[in-house]
Structure formats: structure tokens, C-alpha cells
Amino acid sequence: LKGQEFAPSHQQVYAPLRADGDKPRAHLTVVRQTPTQHFKNQFPALHWEHELGLAFTKNRMNYTNKFLLIPESGDYFIYSQVTFRGMTSECSEIRQAGRPNKPDSITVVITKVTDSYPEPTQLLMGTKSVCEVGSNWFQPIYLGAMFSLQEGDKLMVNVSDISLVDYTKEDKTFFGAFLL
Amino acid sequence: LKGQEFAPSHQQVYAPLRADGDKPRAHLTVVRQTPTQHFKNQFPALHWEHELGLAFTKNRMNYTNKFLLIPESGDYFIYSQVTFRGMTSECSEIRQAGRPNKPDSITVVITKVTDSYPEPTQLLMGTKSVCEVGSNWFQPIYLGAMFSLQEGDKLMVNVSDISLVDYTKEDKTFFGAFLL
Amino acid sequence: LKGQEFAPSHQQVYAPLRADGDKPRAHLTVVRQTPTQHFKNQFPALHWEHELGLAFTKNRMNYTNKFLLIPESGDYFIYSQVTFRGMTSECSEIRQAGRPNKPDSITVVITKVTDSYPEPTQLLMGTKSVCEVGSNWFQPIYLGAMFSLQEGDKLMVNVSDISLVDYTKEDKTFFGAFLL
């Protein structure tokens, strides 16, 4: 009779059952970026706190050298918020001078690197023109979506201008992923 | 033979298996905020609709007195959007007058309260300067991320100015959490 | 003895266990929108790429004719980002002329259609006034939340102005949903 109880549940299952608690997960938080060498023609990658405060990695999801390392294939929800802050851009002055205006902008990209593939893949991009009237501005860009990733894939967050990232608080700028 | 079928699946599992359908979940939607006493030096907390329209709480996730109550320990995805609306801030006029400019701003914070811990923990913050040229402005701030929570933790959403929150529609301003 | 190992786990379960890998999931990406007839008084719906590049549908989650079709009842996390781009709105000029100013705006709505229900339900809305100083502007609106959906429900993404949607890259404008 006990066997009969299990059978229907077992027939419904097409992949091995697994406890949710042992799925790869990470939430990384901002740390101050020191001036470094960037790759030419590529937005610089942020590095992250992975164990202090709100930050954690678990169940074989590891963080190393600006990358989150995907330990098993599957569908992951990936998210990041970057808060930017800066001084007034010159766009209003440029416009007043009557010249065409390519606005200043802030951009966040979540990028996937697959060792067997020569080019990184941009998974998510948030980009915003910045043309503020006030002398100081600040604003977040949030991104999040689901992607099919392979074991060994690496994820990073790139930004258009690393020196505008607000690094002061772990709740303002962060990056995470979890297996669904 | 049936035992052999189950054994491998069982060996893979380090935490008790549980049906997804019985996990704690909530999606709360905006209601009009009544004026209340706010704590000094703390952003006011929003209160929410928890059962009408799109709003719900289920599987022991309860809403009470501005707080979502976490019924069991685990990793939760927590999210909120707050739509703000207001009149032009004075920042453009201030700038024209040549005075230094501290911009108006809008801020959303998702806060965790743990009874055994004296200070609330800010989990997520979205903050944006508002310095609009037009006479009326409106815009959302969205936040979402994963956190390890303990049974008994309480979650709330705080905002910098409760009078600027758009409470007109349940799809514009909301707050939710679910156990992963 | 093996039976005893399984029993506690089984007693905890109130709904049938199911493997995460076979849950309905979709991530759709932007394609160029061809001019079509829009319903009067309704924001136009975007159509999407569902199989090329980063886009996919799986486990009976189907995309057809601008809609994601929900194949089974349950709680879904639904998300979308739409990146808009355009030229300066006239709001600053209008304001200078001393007339009251209803600003230009951009809006994204995630809508649920239930065949048995006459009116679509707006699940999520992100709306933002656009009143930029610079001559070109671009910015994303991101939305995401959890909803209880029924088998047969259909989801779509509506926007206030389809001609302002940035359709150039699959990482800038997207739409997804997955069963929790």
C-alpha cells in the first residue's frame, strides 16, 4: 500500500527530484572598486563582496575574480542593481550651444562567459541617458531575468563608468543568481 | 526493485523534499495610506492590501500591521515596486539662481526586522534624485533580490515621502516575497 | 527500514512532488515591431522572439500571437523590461510658455487575458514621465512580480508607444515567466 502511494508521484517526475535547499545560489554586494586596467573596448567588470553582511554563496555556487561560477546546468534567475551617482552632465550646455547632442549615459550589462565560446554573451542590459538639471544626480538600474546556463559558465556585471558606481551601501548595488 | 528506483533519488536529497505549492508566498498591493505617526529619523512604512484583487498571502505567510511575517527559515526572493508622483522640485530654479543644489529625491527601502536584533536591517534600497523640468512627474522604483531569512523575521517597505506614493492602482505599487 | 526513511518526507507533502526541470518557463526577446491595427483605447501589444538567441519556451509554455499561454495553474513569477528611446519631448518649451504641462510619458503594462472573463487584467504597470533636457533620451522600465494564474490564461506586454521601443538588442527588451 505504501508502494502505491509513491508510484503516482514517481511517474510524474521526469528529472531527479531535488531539495530546494541545496540549489546553487548567490547574492553578492558592492565593494569599492580600486583603479585597475580594463580590457580595451569592453565595459569594466565590477568585483563584489561574497561573504560579509548580506552577501553569500552556497551549494557550489562560487565567486572568484569578478565572476560567479555556475556549478550545474539549468535555468537560473539572474539579477543585479547598480546605483550610479555623479555630477551634472554637459548635455544641457551642449544643447544650448545648438550642437547635436549625444547624451551622457549609464549602462549595466550582465554578461555570460563560456570558455568554449570566444565571445562573451550579453544576457541583460539596462541603459539610460543622463541629462540632469541639478548639480548632483543618483539613480539605480535594475535588471533580472531567467536564462538557461551550462555548468562552467561564468557571470559578471559590467558598467559603462566604474567611477560612478555607488559603493557605500550593500543594499544599493548588488548581483545575484539562483537555480530555479 | 521499486526500492532501487527510489534509492538514487533519495541519496541526492540533503533536505526534506517539499511540494512547491505549499511554500510561503505573498503579493501585496497598494492601498491609500492614512496619516500616521512616523518614527523619528526613519522613513515611514507603507501598509498594504493582502487579500483583495491581485493580493494574496498563502502557506503561513501572514501580513499584519505593515509587516510580512516570515513563517519558516530559508532563502526568499523579495521584491517591491513603488510608483511616485509629484510636482516639480525646486532644483532647476535653485540652479538658475546659482546656489548649490541638493536635489529632491525619492527612496524605497525593503527592511528586515528581527525581534532579537535591536536595529532593522536594510536589505534593498532604490534611491533616485528628482530634478524634473516638467511641472508634474511620475516614475517607479523597482527592487528585487534573494535573502536568507529566519522564521519570525518581519519585512516592510519604507519610503522617503509617503505623500508622493501613487496609491491609485494595484499594478503600480506592490510588495511580495516567496520562499525559493 | 527504507520505508521509514521515506515516510516523514511523504507526510510533509500536501501537493504532488514534481521535478523543477519540467516546470513551464519562457524568456522572450524583442523583435522589430511591424505596424499593425491596434485596439481602440488599448495600448498596443508587443510581439516577441521565442526560440532564437536567448529566447526559449519549455515544458508546455507556448508563445503564440503576442501571448504567452499558461499551461497549468499555479504561482508564476512574471517579468519584463522594455527599453524606450526617443527625441526630446516638448514639455520644457510648454513650461516656458507658462501653460500647464501634462508631460510625455512611457508606460509598460503586463496584462492577463482570461477567456472566460470579458476584461483583461493589468497585473503590472511601470509608467514614467519623460521630460528630458537633452535632445535624445533612452531608458528602461523593468517590472517583475508573482501572480496566481490559471491554466489557459494568456499574458502579453502592452506599451504606450510601440514606435519608441528599442528593438535593436535582445538584452534590452524582454519578457518572461516561470512557474514557481
Epitope: 569599492r32 583603479p35 548639480s135 566604474i162 558606481v165 557605500t168 | - | -
Partner: antibody
């Protein structure tokens, strides 16, 4: 290793101009704001302004507006600060500094002593 | 401009002492406060950012706290190399401004 190397000490007459250089190495010069800060003998630190090497955009403290010019030559990763109409109270050590964010100064040059004296 | 003040302007202490320096801003600067150490004849060295976060490579005996207008730099168990002048600096808005400095001398 991130380094900023400034030009040598200068002695100038009142009313003259001085141009101090700052050569950067060990990081992407165009990726970070470069600041100039001065320190009069026995005094505190005074921020003069920054230059964004990528675009050449600048932001000067009001006090130095009209007298200071910050420029850069990206081909040799070098920034310049020129101060005109020198007065005796401009006598100071002039530092260039770079920050991982635009609002702080991680790495400093060794400083250039500028003496204004007739 | 935001005016930064520091107290005390100087203090005398011994190796092993706990030293506290305060910095006050003329208006709220959130957490955008940095601390620097300057040895005589040298360029300043970056110690603390975001009011309380230690710059990489800075010994853990240094700590910072505060937000808004009132901030503190604490040195637990003063070491011989810590005798120097300490400056706070606000990064909230331009022009960036420094405190006048606190000189920590050997008692």
C-alpha cells in the same frame, strides 16, 4: 601597481602661470576621474577640481573658476593642471589623485611644490 | 559649500591607546564620508570610505562610524606608525571639502 608621478618643483613670480603634469600608470587612465588637491604649508587639504580623462570634461571648485585649467593627453596617460595669475597665497604642494569612484582619492601623486615669490 | 569640522584639532596619546576623532558636516552627507592619514612630508593615504568601510590593506584597528552629519574615526590600540594627521572629506557634493585635520602626537 597604480602610480601617479608629478613634475618637479616650480618657483614663479606673482601674476605668472604654472603648469603641473601628472603621469599615470598601472590602470586605465581614461576610466577614472583625476583630481587636483593642494596643501599650503602647514595647512589643510583643498580640492581644486577634477578632469574626466575619457571626455576631457572638467569640474572646478568655484574658488578657482577662471584661473585653473585642467587638460589631459590620453596618448601618454598624462593630466595637466595650469593655474594662472598666481599670488603668494597659491604657494602650496599640488597633488594629483585618482579614485575608484569620482568622489574620493585612492592614490596620490608625490606632490609638486609651487612657490610664488617675487 | 559643505563645511567640514573636526575635533580635537590635536591630541596626545600613547602606543596601545584607543583614539577617537570626530568629524561634523554642515549638512547631511549621508554616508559619503572618507578618512585619510597623512605623515609629515608625505601624500595623504586613503583609510576609510562610505563612513565605515575599510579600504583594502588598511589594518583592522581602524574603524569608522556615523551617517548624516556626525562621524567618528576610531583607532584601537594605537601603533607607532599611526602618529600622523587625519583628515575627513565629504564626497556628497561638489566642491568636495576636507576637514581641517586632527594631529595625533606621541604623549
Amino acid at each position: 601597481e597604480v602610480q601617479l608621478v608629478e613634475s618637479g618643483a616650480e618657483v614663479k613670480n606673482p601674476g605668472a602661470s604654472v603648469k603641473v603634469s601628472c603621469k599615470a600608470s598601472g590602470y586605465t587612465f581614461t576610466g577614472y576621474y583625476l583630481h587636483w588637491v593642494r596643501q599650503a604649508p602647514g595647512q589643510g587639504l583643498e580640492w581644486m577640481g577634477w578632469i574626466k580623462p575619457k571626455s576631457g570634461g572638467t569640474n572646478y571648485a568655484q574658488k578657482f573658476q577662471g584661473r585653473v585649467t585642467m587638460t589631459r593627453d590620453t596618448s601618454i596617460s598624462t593630466a595637466y593642471m595650469e593655474l594662472s595669475r598666481l599670488r603668494s597665497d597659491d604657494t602650496a604642494v599640488y597633488y594629483c589623485a585618482v579614485g575608484g569612484s569620482y568622489d574620493a582619492f585612492d592614490i596620490w601623486g608625490q606632490g609638486t611644490m609651487v612657490t610664488v615669490s617675487s | 559649500d559643505i563645511v567640514m569640522t573636526q575635533s580635537p584639532s590635536s591630541l596626545s596619546a600613547s602606543v596601545g591607546d584607543r583614539v577617537t576623532i570626530t568629524c561634523r558636516a554642515s549638512q547631511s552627507i549621508s554616508s559619503y564620508l572618507n578618512w585619510y592619514q597623512q605623515q609629515p612630508g608625505k601624500a595623504p593615504k586613503f583609510l576609510i570610505y562610505g563612513a565605515s568601510r575599510l579600504q583594502s590593506g588598511v589594518p583592522s584597528r581602524f574603524s569608522g562610524s556615523g551617517s548624516g552629519t556626525d562621524f567618528t574615526l576610531t583607532i584601537n590600540s594605537l601603533q607607532p606608525e599611526d602618529f600622523a594627521t587625519y583628515f575627513c572629506q565629504q564626497g556628497y557634493s561638489s566642491p568636495f571639502t576636507f576637514g581641517p585635520g586632527t594631529k595625533v602626537e606621541i604623549k
